[in-house]
């Protein structure tokens, strides 16, 4: 007969693994008793249980609780046990000594690995603002056994690099995304993802990105000159600008207070039916936490007694 | 020598719960899977269940609902407990050991007769 | 549930005869058979396990065969004290379940 176990048993974390050890004998053969025992390389062994025929299963002090025999269907030659909520300091070589009758003993070995899943943590780089070079957009960090793998999943552009570093039972993997801020990466997601043979599935982790910036300001109404003339009524200047964080959007008259009558509500500024009184320079000032813009037009109402054309100066400063 | 001895009341009323008790002496509990198995009067054999010494457990899925077995290790002793029980209950219950490297009740109790009637 | 039905169901034969009792599965169960040995008023007893394996201390007259779903218990020379009902019961899958019972009585 021989012995029959695996060369390496794998289990996660806080799972039971199964230590098998199967006697493959002749018709007639009996298995009389099954010692398994942990035998690290220098140092001595540890015995885990003994099986015996007659008086059943004994279960070293240190392992307590911890190894059984499985349920059954059972093998009459299998001399496998179970041992429950794996911990790291479980993994190492074990051996199994089989007595049989009349073949008498046989040994094997083992080697338990325990895989330790990782637990990724994403953690933001600086706020990230157009006009800045190269800039740290997240790091992700997983550590587990073995080295998990941490990659990057994205649309955005931008270089990644990862650094390792090793524990005594495991190791840590953080792998960092470097990008160019630009508005356009505003919303886009920067997913970390990790691999680990511990993981049913790769565990994802995502990121929006937050770019700040602020357009330049403009204003519209002015288009059609011609409309700008006494007596209009619904006339309204717009301030034209985005940013991230969102603008906040302020009026004011450059030669003076803004008229009496006028509207300020946010981006626009409505006008009561036109007098000459409301001819002069509106600036409209944009501005967030980023940055600040302004814009300024000429508002000339005309009179349409007069023949004299309107005339409408556009500055915009920033 | 191990030997198995099923202790309980060999009278039950109808709907009330049946409760037995197997000691192991001559050896321990510990290390084996114990079952419990019933015959009523000249018919077959019927399994009820197992439990492991640690405490795991198995049922017939027909009985299970109203089964329980359970084991105290410092008494050497396991348990069973069949509620809302009917005449059709009415059997000589054993207990038994697995083997342990193999399937099979290598040692019995002699068995106890219980019968449910009002 | 696995059904298991042993025939015969009664079996009258002489002291020295050779008895052979039939269990089948109504699906496969490897080799996780048993047989037990019963006698009026007393518990069973195990004769075989894992479908061919002698329990220790068993006359060897007795012994077992098969696997799949046919199973055989064969007694070489009945002896006096083999008089009693027979038992077949599998393992492979729960609920473990047990033979009807073959009753070798004497002739």
């Known amino acids: 007969g021989e012995l029959e176990t695996s060369d390496v048993v794998t289990v996660v974390l806080g799972q039971d693994a199964k230590l098998p050890c199967f006697y493959r004998g002749d018709s007639g053969e009996q298995v009389g008793q099954v010692a398994w025992a942990r035998v690290d390389a220098g140092e001595g062994a540890q015995e885990l249980a003994l099986l015996h025929s007659k008086y059943g299963l004994h279960v070293s002090p240190a392992y307590e609780g911890r190894v059984e025999q499985p349920p059954p269907p059972r093998n009459p030659l299998d001399g496998s046990v179970l041992l429950r909520n794996a911990v790291q300091a479980d993994e190492g070589e074990y051996e199994c000594r089989v007595s049989t009758f009349p073949a008498g003993s046989f040994q094997a070995r083992l080697r338990l690995r325990v895989l330790v899943p990782p637990l990724p943590s994403l953690n933001p780089g600086p706020a990230l603002e157009e006009g800045q070079g190269l800039t740290l957009a997240a790091s992700c960090t997983a550590e587990g056994s073995p080295a998990p793998s941490v990659t990057w999943d994205t649309e955005v552009k931008g270089t990644t690099s990862s650094r390792s570093f090793k524990h005594s039972r495991s190791a840590a993997v953080t792998s960092e995304f470097h990008l160019v801020p630009s508005r356009s990466m505003n919303g886009q997601p920067l997913t970390c993802v990790v691999s680990h043979p511990g993981l049913l599935q790769d565990q994802r982790i995502t990121h929006i990105l937050h770019v700040s910036f602020l357009a330049e300001a403009s204003v519209r109404g002015l288009e059609d000159q011609n409309l700008w003339h006494i007596g209009r009524e619904g006339a309204m200047l717009k301030c034209l600008s985005e940013g991230q964080p969102p603008p906040s959007y302020n009026w004011t008259r450059l030669d003076g207070p803004l008229p009496s009558g006028v509207r300020v509500d946010g981006d626009t500024l409505g006008f009561p039916p036109l007098t000459t009184e409301h001819s002069g320079i509106y600036v409209c000032h944009v501005s967030n936490e980023f940055s600040s813009r302004d814009s300024q037009v000429t508002v000339d109402v005309l009179d349409p007694q007069e023949d004299s054309g309107k005339q409408v100066d556009l500055v915009s400063a920033s | 020598q191990v030997q198995l001895q099923e202790s309980g009341p060999g009278l039950v009323k109808p709907s009330e719960t049946l409760s037995l008790t197997c000691t192991v002496s001559g050896g321990s509990i510990s290390g084996y899977y114990w079952s419990w198995i019933r015959q009523p009067p000249g018919k077959g054999l019927e399994w009820i269940g197992y439990i492991y010494y640690s405490g795991s457990t198995n049922y017939n899925p027909s009985l299970k609902s109203r089964v329980t077995i359970s084991v105290d290790t410092s008494k050497n002793q396991f348990s069973l407990k069949l509620s809302s029980v009917t005449a059709a209950d009415t059997a000589v219950y054993y207990c038994?050991?697995?083997?342990?490297?193999?399937?099979?009740?290598?040692?019995w109790g002699q068995g106890t007769l219980v019968t449910v009637s009002s | 549930d696995i059904q298991l039905t042993q025939s015969p169901s009664f079996l009258s034969a002489s002291v020295g005869d050779r008895v052979t009792i039939t269990c089948r599965a109504s699906?496969?169960?490897?080799?996780?058979l048993a047989w037990y040995q019963q006698k009026p008023g007393k518990a069973p007893k195990l004769l075989i396990y894992?479908?061919?394996t002698l329990q220790s201390g068993v006359p060897s007259r007795f012994s077992g065969s098969g696997s799949g779903t046919e199973f055989t218990l064969t007694i070489s020379s009945l002896q006096p004290e083999d008089f009693a009902t027979y038992y077949c019961?599998?393992?492979?899958?729960?609920?473990?379940?047990f033979g009807q019972g073959t009753k070798v009585e004497i002739k």
């Open positions: 699906q496969g169960i490897s080799s996780y």
């Open positions: 019961q599998q393992f492979n899958s729960y609920p473990w379940t």
């Open positions: 038994a050991r697995l083997g342990i490297f193999f399937d099979a009740f290598d040692i």
């Open positions: 894992a479908a061919s």
